[in-house]
């Protein structure tokens, strides 16, 4: 028997489904009590689902798991994870049990979308150019960890002066907090970019000084 | 070319535990299905228990459940047995053994260890 | 657990012969057996699996057949090289488990 998963890694995002392919080629005559199939957490080998002698043993994970019963005799081995967490991340393996065995481990990458980012001055009033200014873009609920990117009112990078700290929720998704420490020209525009790597996602949020009144 | 080399003899007293290793080179280890068979003097082949080590559970014989112990370490592509509460019934031949990958066949046998077993 | 039961303990029969080797499941083991060939001093060698196919580099002379409970192994003509005991294995489909006939010893007349 020869187990075929995907290459590239499964990407789903927190509280939506996700499917680990997983197929294999059942010889003619091929029937399910012949099938023994074992999903498992390809670093701990903590079973995860299992279909022996015939049935569906059902799920040894949190009860989020399920296969595709109707597709199994086809050689559809794939395992459903119901409301994907954060904490499912990782390498699953998916190992088949016929006349032979063969396994193949596939990955699941875990995402969330980060929030818009809001942005705060401090001082935020009498400003004037010269004076020296904390610009905090924040962001919020995201995962993985965000790339955040500085720039001015012409594009130009701002790298100097750039404090970033992430911190994980109980539900382990990033608050993002990024601070910007400037000198104020005679007017000008902030922004900051909240990149996800894994969705490839940007959420921006700028502020610009135009003397007085600010807008954000 | 398969190669299975097992730890050399060994003599135990009553009681105590041996535990015999087999290094295993020729393939991906972590995809073969590994074998412990003893035989004792003059006697026939008994299986005690076996493991797939990229599945991770080792499956035992009912005469050798709870004094047997087999695990497999996928760095070193090496397995163990362990047999405690040694009596002078357990002097014998171990083996370990494989087949091809993916394959439940036993049909490559290491050198084999001689447990003796004596007060 | 499966038994296997091999007769004859000892098959006694001279070079050029043919041999029939019996082996019997208390319950029926699909086609999931294996003989096996054992010399004094040496590991066992697979000869047949999955009930009748040869193993690599076995003379045709070894032959398998059976299901269910009842199997057999076949010389069809003994050579001198093939004077040992032999062992009939069955593996269960799940978990991965594996029992041993008693043998059958195969001596020169």
């Known amino acids: 028997v020869e187990v075929q998963v995907s290459e590239d890694p499964v990407v789903a995002l927190v509280d939506t489904d996700a499917t680990l392919r997983c197929s294999f080629s059942p010889e003619p005559g091929f029937s399910l009590a012949q099938l023994n199939l074992i999903w498992q957490l390809t670093d701990t080998k903590q079973l995860v689902h299992s279909f022996t002698e015939g049935r569906d043993q059902g799920s040894a994970y949190s009860n989020r798991t399920a296969l595709f019963p109707d597709l199994l005799v086809q050689g559809n081995a794939s395992l459903r994870l119901q409301r994907v967490r954060v904490t499912d991340e990782g390498s699953y393996t998916c190992f088949v049990s016929i006349q032979d065995f063969d396994s193949a481990a596939v990955s699941l990458q875990v995402a969330a979308p980060y929030s818009k980012p809001s942005m705060t001055l401090e001082p935020n009033k009498d400003l004037r150019p010269g004076n020296m200014v904390t610009i905090t873009c924040s962001s919020y609920q995201g995962y993985p960890e965000a790339e955040v990117f500085w720039k001015d009112g012409q594009g130009v990078p701002l790298t100097g002066n750039v404090t970033t700290s992430q911190m994980a929720n109980e539900r382990g998704l990033f608050d993002v907090h990024s601070v910007l420490r400037v000198v104020l020209g005679a007017n000008g525009t902030y922004s900051c970019l909240v990149r996800n790597p894994v969705l490839q996602q940007d959420a921006h949020g700028s502020v610009t000084i135009t003397g007085q009144p600010l807008t954000f | 070319e398969v190669q299975l080399v097992q730890s050399g003899a060994e003599v135990k007293k009553p009681g105590s535990s041996v535990k015999v290793s087999c290094k295993a080179s020729g393939g991906t280890f972590s995809s073969y299905a590994i074998s412990w068979v003893r035989q004792a003097p003059g006697q026939g082949l008994e299986w005690m228990g076996g493991?797939?080590?990229?599945?991770?559970?080792?499956n035992y014989a009912q005469k050798f459940q709870g004094r047997v112990t087999i695990t497999a370490d996928e760095s070193t592509s090496t397995a163990y047995m362990e047999l405690s509460s040694l009596r002078s019934e357990d002097t014998a031949v171990y083996y370990c053994?494989?087949?091809?990958?993916?394959?439940?066949?036993?049909?490559?046998w290491g050198q084999g260890t001689l447990v003796t077993v004596s007060a | 657990e499966i038994v296997l039961t091999q007769s004859p303990a000892t098959l006694s029969l001279s070079p050029g012969e043919r041999a029939t080797l019996s082996c019997r499941a208390s319950?029926?083991?699909?086609?999931?057996l294996a003989w096996y060939q054992q010399k004094p001093g040496q590991a066992p060698r697979l000869l047949i699996y999955d009930a009748s196919n040869r193993a690599t580099g076995i003379p045709a002379r070894f032959s398998g057949s059976g299901s269910g409970t009842d199997f057999t192994l076949t010389i069809s003509s003994l050579e001198p090289e093939d004077f040992a005991v032999y062992y009939c294995q069955q593996r269960s489909n799940w978990p991965p488990m594996y029992t041993f006939g008693q043998g059958t010893k195969l001596e020169i007349k």
């Open positions: 493991i797939i080590p990229i599945f991770g559970t080792a």
């Open positions: 319950q029926s083991v699909s086609s999931y």
């Open positions: 053994a494989r087949g091809e990958r993916g394959s439940y066949l036993i049909d490559y």
